[in-house]
């Protein structure tokens, strides 16, 4: 058992052009916090896969408000270390994900909102008990500087925290066959309980007589390195010079999978299929529980009450991801019908409906003419979500309540004079023009551009075409 410790030194704009905008502003002050996720081995796993070695969240950092016009500085960080306890052996090789999260503290409806600012990932080799390792990782225009180490919790010691130490029984020396426990020289190694000959560097045991191998080693005593070169036979040729495994006991011999996991051989080593709630190369690690608060943005943690059951997050509408960490553009689903305008208010979705439509999603087509009478003999016409009156001659306006001035639009062309008449309008045309709207010139020879004028009317007389 032991603890992986992560110390964040700085988070801010990386070198070079294109400095990122500050994530906080006077209108939207915010503070940072960090999440670390550890997985055993060097496998490239998806960000959403379980943090089989463990995970931790930092405290919130100090509230930060951007100074207008100033470039984004290194942002204020939370105090303290991020600590990820591990229960069993330290695997020696591990993958990490470090996420920088922003908590917005503005007056937006719904209180604090969380959003992921940056995510860095890597794969490292690390011996427990060693010094702090320093690292710099970049995510887009951001740069994260940090240090990390793994340390064993007493009584465990060694590069994998698998050797046990006990206080000396005699003041001067350790018992027969037992070495001092460096660096705790006043303690002695506990009596060996592993299978005789089990490699002290590459093997470990949790029960008497067994020998389990750390990643990269195989064989009954964990003394055979797993080769990355290609081998000809399933377990490699017998030639020791090739670096391949010699024929012999398989990597699943003695079942290296803990907690009821089942072992299957792979070309390079072995693979454990773990029961629900256990993870890791040898099913030695149980996952994050609901007590770790893994669900962001108001997500509810379901299941995961104990390490034997995996949790899931039920996300509020507008968020998704295994930890509700991703904001969804809910308007992209076009929930508003009939041309309504979608507004994502964060705490709720609203549709602004076009005229003639109603309902939360503008799904109700209002009967535009229902209860709407058109006055003075007008008739109601539905269309385009808005009612319209087709008015009888001499009336106008939205409901045909206004007496129309037929001459208001100056309908008589070429200087003709307009007269309002009970049945419409009459144009008195200027000399040389004729037609209902004085639109046709009379030709100099007296012939009009139209067929002959109606009987009884001379060209130039007021024309009334009703």
């Amino acid at each position: 058992a032991g603890v992986f410790e992560l110390q964040i030194h700085s988070f801010g704009p990386g070198p070079g052009p294109g400095a990122p905008r500050s994530p906080c502003s006077a209108r939207l002050p915010c503070r940072l916090f960090f999440r670390v996720c550890l997985k055993p081995g060097l496998s490239e796993e998806a960000a959403e896969s379980p943090c089989a070695l463990g995970a931790a969240l930092s405290a919130r950092g100090p509230v930060y408000t951007e100074q207008p016009g100033a470039p984004a500085p290194d942002l204020p960080l939370p105090d303290g270390l991020l600590q990820v306890p591990f229960r069993d052996a330290w695997p020696g090789t591990f993958s990490f994900i470090i996420e920088t999260w922003r908590e917005e503290l503005g007056d937006q409806i719904g209180g604090p909102a969380w959003s992921l600012l940056a995510r860095v990932a890597g794969r490292r080799r690390l011996a427990a008990g060693g010094p702090w390792a320093r690292d710099i990782q970049r995510a887009g225009a951001w740069e994260l500087r940090f240090s990390y180490r793994a340390r064993c919790e007493p009584p465990a010691v060694g590069t994998a925290c698998t050797r046990l130490c006990r206080p000396r029984s005699a003041p001067s020396r350790c018992g027969p066959g037992l070495r001092p426990c460096a660096p705790l020289e006043d303690e002695c190694e506990a009596p060996l309980v592993c299978r005789a000959g089990c490699s002290p560097e590459h093997g470990f045991c949790e029960q008497p007589g067994e020998c389990r191998c750390l990643e990269g080693w195989t064989g009954p005593l964990c003394t055979v390195p797993v080769s990355t070169s290609s081998c000809l036979s399933p377990r490699g040729p017998s030639s020791a010079t090739t670096g391949c495994l010699v024929p012999g006991p398989g990597p699943c011999d003695g079942n290296p999978c803990a907690n009821g996991g089942s072992c299957s051989e792979t070309p390079r080593s072995f693979e454990c299929t773990c029961p629900r709630g256990f993870y890791g190369l040898r099913c030695e690690v149980s996952g994050v529980t609901c007590a770790d608060g893994p669900c962001f943005n108001g997500g509810l943690c379901v299941g995961g009450a104990d390490p034997d059951s995996a949790y899931i997050c039920h996300c509020p509408p507008g968020f998704q991801g295994s930890n509700c960490e991703k904001r969804v553009d809910r308007c992209s689903l076009q929930p508003c019908r009939n041309g309504g305008l979608c507004l994502d208010l964060g705490h709720a979705l609203r549709c602004r409906c076009r005229a003639g439509f109603a309902g939360p999603r503008c799904e109700h087509d209002l009967d535009d003419c229902a209860g709407r009478a058109c006055a003075n003999g007008g008739t109601c016409v539905e269309g385009g979500g808005a009612h319209r009156c087709s008015c009888a001659l001499g009336f106008g306006g939205r409901d045909c309540r206004e007496r129309a001035d037929p001459c208001a639009a100056r309908p008589c062309a070429h200087g003709g004079r307009c007269y309002a008449h009970f049945s419409g309008l009459v144009c008195a045309c200027a000399p040389g023009y004729m037609g209902a709207r004085c639109e046709f010139p009379v030709h100099p020879d007296g012939a009009s551009a139209l067929p002959a004028a109606p009987p009884g009317l001379r060209p130039g007389d007021p024309q009334r075409y009703l």
Partner: antibody
Framework: QVQLQESGPGLVKPSETLSLTCTVS????????WSWIRQPPGKGLEWIGY???????NHNPSLKSRLTISLDKAKNQFSLRLSSVTAADTAVYYC????????????WGQGTMVTVSS | EIVLTQSPGTLSLSPGERATLSCRAS???????LAWYQQKPGQAPRLLIY???SRATGIPDRFTGSGSGTDFTLTISRLEPEDFAVYYC?????????FGGGTKVEIN
């Protein structure tokens, strides 16, 4: 303003199934989680379960084996069925909308009293 | 499940006085996912506070929520006649959702 209205029988016999419906007006049922909560006479509140329009449900483990929550998008309703009822299930049953910033309850029905008695 | 214990069970105060209600959780509530409700006789509960400290829409600023981890407080700075009611806390970080047993604020 969104309104919730519970409906169902006020009296249920022991060992029978309690069925209640909640009708949502002035909002689409498709945007929220919808929940049932109950309150025995003179006692505190107990969460029963919730449903999302996608079909996701979550039930109180103490009731899970007897509980069914379903949703009818066309009618803008969601329902509760609690089987094998006893006198201990006598309570005011509330339907409520789950708040969009977390699983608190921002809009409640006025509640309906259900008595389990023979 | 997370058990919420509210204290005191009953609080006898006069209008204008300050009320301090406590809600203690049996284990840490993640991300301050705690709400407070007010319930008057014959009525449904009404959401007052969510996220431990954010007031719900239309709630007067005399209601203030605070706390984190396992200890949370609802403070009513100056009691108005309409504030005499039963108050419940509720956690929504971990399923099952649970409520406290309630604190009754009554007129002294």
């Amino acid at each position: 303003q969104v309104q919730l209205q519970e409906s169902g029988p006020g009296l249920v016999k022991p060992s029978e199934t309690l069925s209640l419906t909640c009708t949502v007006s002035d909002d689409s049922i498709s945007n929220y989680y919808w929940s049932w909560i109950r309150q025995p006479p003179g006692k505190g509140l107990e969460w029963i379960g919730y449903i999302f329009y996608s079909g996701t449900t979550n039930h109180n483990p103490s009731l899970k084996s007897r509980l069914t929550i379903s949703l009818d998008k066309a009618k803008n309703q969601f329902s509760l069925r609690l089987s094998s009822v006893t006198a201990a299930d006598t309570a005011v049953y509330y339907c409520a909308r789950v708040f969009n910033w977390g699983f608190a309850f921002d809009i409640w029905g006025q509640g309906t009293m259900v008595t389990v008695s023979s | 499940e997370i058990v919420l214990t509210q204290s005191p069970g009953t609080l006898s105060l006069s209008p204008g006085e300050r009320a301090t209600l406590s809600c203690r959780a049996s284990q840490r509530i993640s991300r301050t996912y705690l709400a407070w409700y007010q319930q008057k006789p014959g009525q449904a509960p009404r959401l007052l506070i969510y996220g431990a400290s954010s007031r719900a829409t239309g709630i007067p600023d005399r209601f203030t929520g605070s706390g984190s981890g396992t200890d949370f407080t609802l403070t009513i700075s100056r009691l108005e006649p309409e504030d005499f009611a039963v108050y419940y806390c509720q956690q929504y970080g971990t399923s099952p959702l649970t409520f406290g047993g309630g604190t009754k604020v009554e007129i002294n």
